[in-house]
């Protein structure tokens, strides 16, 4: 997240961490119910730990943490690495979770987002493109939906329904690391953090979302058949 | 099959240009970033231009810079690298690289170049 | 710039043997490196990519390893078509930079 300011702790309990090997960040996800994450699915990777209810980017042990694997990965099935289009996945968690303060689902929002929309999205990703400066806790940072034909105008052939686009001004955005994260909007999930340009943050180029109200069924038959 | 094959090389005197051209085939060129990686003769690889899918973001070497352009066409499948000032340090084997890694996603992974040219050949001498 | 330290510059090798080529980063990459093949006349072939995983169809006698600056590439039992000069790339940063590359030549 690139200028965005400290979460509140526990603030953001449904966020999560997907790592490789010991502590190695590579995307945000989200809890959405005991069991299950929502990511992006150009987040799938073969083997990596899911960490959940951890404000610090450091490894160092936290009471409200709770760490999983991840024993099944589904991509959406219109998905096609390295494109962006339908860039979401469900993962399966080895155990439930254990409800607390700390570590709680985020109920996904039905409606889409209307423009003008305020909403918050989080991350450990990085804070500039640089690559290697990373936040010491969760970033979060208020974005507001942009509408349709200024998404296209910023992305012109990239854009379709599956995606929103949401900024602020020149400076603010997502950036590496914080693919799969939440942007919640009015108490619910309303997209993941999927693409935007390179480097982030650039003016009339906001971050673009996955726009999680195109796949709700989906998301709740997948669940339900697996 | 996925393919890329370079064209455009030839002998040129120092301060000429050239326009080297990349055609890609067998894979969904308009989604991926691409690369120019050059090779002066008994050298080792030395990274000379990238663009990313949608052309908004490119990024040169010291050595070429405001002398070599890099632009894609997504509808022709096709990769350019429009040469200018050339010197006699630019003599070498040219190749298009496909780049694995999407700089617009917003995961921190990144993989490498997967698919190469053949390579053009250019040589810069009077 | 990053600038990418290959050693050996070359090695010779019998068939079977075990080889270590070693790259290390001016500066922290994290596991952003990958490691390509390159054999005389040919184009560059990636072999291994985020320093440790195998590119598809890459045999299972090369491995990677490493992270931050000290980077390592193994073939656990050199064969004929092993012989080929090894470079590697850090990735996360512009300029890309590549090694100097390692010639794995035949004893």
């Known amino acids: 997240i690139v200028n965005g300011s400290d979460c509140q702790k526990d603030a953001q309990p449904w966020q999560g961490a997907l790592l490789l090997g010991p502590n190695k960040l590579y995307c945000g996800a989200v809890l959405i119910s005991p069991q299950w994450l929502l990511t992006a699915a150009h987040c799938r990777k073969p083997v990596f730990r899911i960490r959940l209810g951890h404000h610090s980017m450091s490894p160092v042990y936290e009471s409200g943490q709770q760490m999983f694997q991840g024993i099944k990965s589904i991509p959406h099935p219109g998905y096609s690495h390295p494109g962006h289009s339908n860039d979401l996945m469900l993962i399966k968690m080895n155990r439930k979770i254990r409800d607390s303060h700390s570590v709680k689902p985020v109920e996904i929002a039905c409606d889409c987002a209307t423009e003008g929309t305020r909403c918050m999205v989080s991350g450990w990703g990085t804070t500039s493109s640089s690559h290697n400066n990373f936040p010491k806790v969760l970033q979060c940072l208020n974005i507001t939906v942009l509408s349709e034909e200024r998404c296209k105008n910023s992305y012109p052939g990239q854009i379709d329904k599956t995606m929103f686009c949401a900024g602020d001004e020149e400076g603010r955005d997502s950036c590496q690391g914080d693919s799969g994260g939440p942007v919640v909007c009015n108490g619910k999930l309303q997209g993941l953090v999927s693409w935007g340009d390179f480097p982030c943050a650039q003016r009339n180029r906001p971050g673009v979302y996955t726009n999680l109200c195109e796949f709700v069924k989906w998301i709740k038959d997948t669940m339900n058949s697996n | 099959e996925v393919q890329l094959v370079e064209s455009g090389g030839g002998l040129v005197q120092p301060g000429g240009s050239l326009r080297l051209s990349c055609a890609a085939s067998?894979?969904?060129?308009?989604?991926?970033?691409m690369n120019w990686v050059r090779q002066a003769p008994g050298k080792g690889l030395e990274w000379v231009s990238y663009?990313?899918?949608?052309?908004?973001?490119?990024y040169y070497a010291d050595s070429v810079k405001g002398r070599f352009t890099i632009s894609r066409d997504n509808a022709k499948n096709s990769l350019y690298l429009q040469m200018n000032s050339l010197r006699a340090e630019d003599t070498a084997v040219y190749y298009c690289?496909?780049?694995?890694?999407?700089?617009?996603?917003?995961?921190?992974?990144?993989?490498?170049?997967?698919?190469w040219g053949q390579g053009t050949t250019v040589t810069v001498s009077s | 710039d990053i600038q990418m330290t290959q050693s050996p510059s070359s090695v010779s090798a019998s068939v079977g043997d075990r080889v270590t080529i070693t790259c290390r980063a001016s500066?922290?990459?994290?596991?952003?490196l990958a490691w390509y093949q390159q054999k005389p006349g040919k184009a560059p072939k990636l072999l291994i990519y985020?320093?440790?995983s195998l590119q598809s169809g890459v045999p299972s006698r090369f491995s990677g390893s490493g992270s931050g600056t000290d980077f390592t590439l193994t073939i656990s039992s050199l064969q004929p078509e092993d012989f080929a000069t090894y470079y590697c790339?850090?990735?996360?940063?512009?300029?890309?930079?590549f090694g100097g590359g390692t010639k794995v030549e035949i004893k």
């Open positions: 690289a496909r780049d694995l890694t999407s700089m617009q996603s917003r995961d921190y992974y990144y993989y490498g170049m997967d698919v």
């Open positions: 067998g894979f969904t060129f308009s989604s991926y970033s």
């Open positions: 663009i990313s899918s949608s052309s908004s973001t490119i």
């Open positions: 500066q922290g990459i994290s596991s952003w």
């Open positions: 985020a320093a440790s």
């Open positions: 790339q850090q990735v996360p940063i512009f300029p890309y930079t």
